[in-house]
Amino acid sequence: CDLPQTHSLGNRRALILLAQMGRISPFSCLKDRHDFGFPQEEFDGNQFQKAQAISVLHEMIQQTFNLFSTKDSSATWEQSLLEKFSTELNQQLNDMEACVIQEVGVEETPLMNVDSILAVKKYFQRITLYLTEKKYSPCAWEVVRAEIMRSFSLSKIFQERLRRKE
């Protein structure tokens, strides 16, 4: 399964689309910055089996997809870029699912890293709560967009390590 290579390219495309989606300059939104507590430790561990590592990445992509699929998101971002971004994420999710099956064998159920997946879920809950508290303001979305870009770039390092392990 050649996921790390293909996913890395997909990740780069997603990052470029996210960058292009920006509506207002972050310079205007400095006061709205927020530390969402990206679960860096979940992407630092070398103890993962490849299938487990992919399942954590899958959760992050899935949560990102969900976040940008809301009606509030549709009202904020330029539709054509949002659609391209969602399509890119969807493609990555499909690739990952196929890769996990290939990695562990069709009959076996992959051992999920429950704690790591929960940490990713909680991270996105904090993001959603922030957006709600800020009433989905343009600056709040800008902060979130920048945060997702940052989390994608951090997970890219994780993927590169995964590729080196192969």
């Epitope: 292009q20 920006g22 310079f27 400095l30 902060v143 770039s153």
Partner: antibody, heavy 121, light 107 residues
Framework: QVQLVQSGAEVKKPGSSVKVSCKAS????????ISWVRQAPGQGLEWMGG????????NYAQKFQGRVTITADESTSTAYMELSSLRSEDTAVYYC??????????????WGQGTLVTVSS | DIQMTQSPSSLSASVGDRVTITCRAS??????LNWYQQKPGKAPKLLIY???SLQSGVPSRFSGSGSGTDFTLTISSLQPEDFATYYC?????????FGQGTKVEIK
């Protein structure tokens, strides 16, 4: 390895304009912010404004609004700062400074070597 | 605009001394404060960000503290290469503003 290389020193007449360039290498040029900071001889540091190339539009300090134009050319990974209606008080070293990639533009992580602009009749 | 005031404007110290520079903001800036070191004829260098986080590659003798309006940069044991001018900078809102600088000279 991140590097910011600025254009050379300039001597300008009062009332004229100056355009300073800053060529960046390392990282994805379009996705990080570049600010311009100036320092008059023997004085402190002063933020003039900044740009994130992917956005195109720049933010300026009120003091320089209308007199400064910050632009970026993604094809050459170069940022520019143009200051018009120059006066003697604009004599300073002008620095470009890069902010971290995929982060809010709040701290200046990398700096150019500086460009001395002298305004004299 | 947020005004940043540093004190003292200059100080004389010896190698091995503990040096403290303070920075006060005209309004609360949370922890959005950075410290820079500048040597003559050189560009500034980031030392501390977000009030107390040490920039990668900066010696551990440098430390920062504070939040709200009052901040401190401490050099625990001054080294010959630390004689320079130090600036604080707020990043709470634009325009990003700097303190007037503190020059650390050899006694």
């Amino acid at each position: 390895q991140v590097q910011l290389v600025q254009s050379g020193a300039e001597v300008k007449k009062p009332g004229s304009s100056v355009k300073v360039s800053c060529k960046a290498s390392g990282g994805t040029f379009s996705s990080y912010a570049i600010s311009w900071v100036r320092q008059a001889p023997g004085q402190g540091l002063e933020w003039m404004g900044g740009i994130i190339p992917i956005f195109g539009t720049a933010n300026y300090a009120q003091k320089f609004q209308g007199r400064v134009t910050i632009t970026a050319d993604e094809s050459t990974s170069t940022a520019y700062m143009e200051l018009s209606s120059l006066r003697s008080e604009d004599t300073a070293v002008y620095y470009c400074a890069r902010h971290l990639e995929y982060a809010f533009p709040d701290k200046f992580d990398y700096w150019g070597q500086g460009t001395l602009v002298t305004v004299s009749s | 605009d947020i005004q940043m005031t540093q004190s003292p404007s200059s100080l004389s110290a010896s190698v091995g001394d503990r040096v403290t520079i303070t920075c006060r903001a005209s309004q609360s800036i949370s922890s959005y404060l950075n410290w820079y070191q500048q040597k003559p004829g050189k560009a500034p260098k980031l030392l501390i960000y977000f009030a107390s986080s040490l920039q990668s590659g900066v010696p551990s003798r440098f430390s920062g503290s504070g939040s709200g309006t009052d901040f401190t940069l401490t050099i625990s044991s001054l080294q010959p290469e630390d004689f320079a001018t130090y600036y604080c900078q707020q990043s709470y809102s634009t325009p990003l503003t700097f303190g007037q600088g503190t020059k650390v000279e050899i006694k």
